[in-house]
Interface confidence: medium
């Protein structure tokens, strides 16, 4: 006997559906109506035939009361080929829900997204997370998707993007976006970062995560941020192969005074990089290849310094920097 495709936990909180049959019984997903977190994985299916069974142009207001009653706050949809028209139909209906976080992963979006009708209301998401989503429209995908969202988006995460650079002239500003996570786009690089950080479109960014994005030097990142007018409070550059030295011909970059937390862990550093901000509240240099304790003149003025997991540190040695937060135990790096 084949297992049930959908499982709802005992608290009616989380519901996970894995539709792996070639012709799945989608009605099984109805048992998720009472859940707060819903995950639907479509087993790589092409949902094109779905368009014949649903009227994507129907007025979603007819479903408003039903959708408003749903408890769902977090929705994950994964592993499918989805016509843009179907995605738009779903977004129009979900606009009446209390959905706060939408995650799309391992999806191939085919066709173009139509413009938002005048009478339609956008989806009031707090968080949008995309992982390995490809769009037929190339660089304009963010602008197309953005028009279906209300302007209150706070968190945007884009990983394994097929086109991490956006068509900046088409993108509207994200006035409320405080956290942007572009991690796990190893082909991005510093030039790609400049293209992705559309100038003046992210005025409220406080947290920027760039883990595993092909960044080369902190100075190069500084230049990209300065060009875009992005001034994060917290910057995560961990899991990049960073060079400690700066190209002598490159112009010096002044970091924004807003930056107070910098994560340079797992960056393969053999020495403290040049060109760091002069003052930081938090600096994480853990799990690098530092063979000696950094000298005070190599470091920014920093309140909390983490150096755990570097070769020079042996459990039980004295803390190498006043105010540092080393545990004395070498972590599994």
């Amino acid at each position: 006997t084949t297992p049930e495709p959908c499982e709802l936990d005992d608290e009616d909180f989380r519901c996970v559906c894995n539709f792996s049959e070639p012709q799945p019984d989608w009605s099984e997903a109805f048992q998720c109506v009472s859940a707060v977190e819903v995950e639907i994985h479509a087993g790589g299916l092409n949902l094109e035939p779905f368009l014949k069974r649903v009227d994507a142009d129907a007025d979603p207001r007819q479903y408003a009361d039903t959708v408003k009653a749903l408890r769902v706050r977090r929705l994950t949809v994964g592993a499918a080929q989805v016509p843009a028209q179907l995605l738009v139909g779903a977004l129009r209906v979900l606009a009446y829900s209390r959905l706060k976080e939408l995650t799309l992963e391992d999806l191939k979006i085919t066709g173009t997204m139509p413009p938002l009708p005048l009478e339609a209301t956008g989806l009031a998401l707090s968080s949008l997370r995309l992982r390995n989503v490809s769009w037929a429209t190339g660089r304009s995908w963010l602008a197309e998707l953005q028009q279906w969202l209300k302007p209150g988006l706070k968190v945007l995460s884009i990983a394994q993007a097929h086109s991490p650079a956006f068509s900046c002239e088409q993108v509207r500003a994200f006035p409320a976006l405080t956290s942007l996570d572009l991690s796990d786009n190893p082909g991005l690089g510093e030039r790609g970062l400049m293209a992705a950080l559309c100038p003046h479109k992210f005025p409220a960014i406080q947290n920027l995560a760039l883990r595993n994005t092909g960044m080369e030097t902190p100075t190069g990142v500084c230049a990209a941020l300065a060009a875009a007018g992005v001034q994060p409070h917290s910057l995560d550059l961990s899991h990049n192969s960073l060079r400690a030295t700066v190209n002598p011909s490159a112009p010096r970059c002044m970091w924004s005074s807003a930056l107070n937390s910098l994560n340079l862990s797992f960056a393969g550093l053999e020495q403290v990089p040049k060109g760091l901000p002069a003052k930081l509240r938090v600096l994480d240099l853990s799990c690098n290849r530092l063979n000696r304790a950094p000298q005070p003149d190599e470091l920014p003025e920093v309140d909390n310094l983490t150096l755990d997991g570097n070769p020079f540190l042996v459990p039980g040695t004295a803390l190498p920097h006043e105010g540092s937060m080393n545990s004395g135990v070498v972590p599994a790096c």
Partner: nanobody
């Protein structure tokens, strides 16, 4: 740990007023929505009022009688309840949607208070 602390509930005569407060404490990064829900005996939890990005939303049954407001500096949301009716009797819960805390700024988080009892006698 992020916590919500409600206060202001109690016993009031029909037609009277109460003001509920809900303070968010802990390592908050960014509050998106704050709202009030209620649960009457034997019934499900229902939305009373919420403050979302740039807009307010009320249940039809409280429109014109209840007002939700927020003090961003104090991370506190209020519910001013006027012209109270016996059918408003319930436990009132505060709810906050946070996009991240200082230790995890890239996650959405939902937090509920313990609830405060409101009883309206006829």
């Amino acid at each position: 740990q992020v916590q919500l602390q409600e206060s202001g509930g109690g016993l009031v005569q029909s037609g009277g007023s109460l003001r509920l407060s809900c303070a968010v404490s802990g390592s908050i990064f960014s509050i998106v929505d704050m709202g009030w829900y209620r649960q009457a005996p034997g019934k499900g939890r229902e939305l009373v009022a919420e403050l979302s990005y740039g807009s307010t939303n009320y249940a039809d049954s409280v429109l014109g009688r209840f007002t939700i407001s927020r003090d961003n500096a104090k991370n506190t949301v209020y519910l001013q309840m006027n012209s109270l009716k016996p059918e408003d009797t319930a436990v009132y819960y505060c709810n906050a949607d946070l996009t991240g805390t200082s230790w995890s700024p890239y996650r959405y988080l939902e937090v509920w208070g313990q609830g405060t009892q409101v009883t309206v006698s006829s």
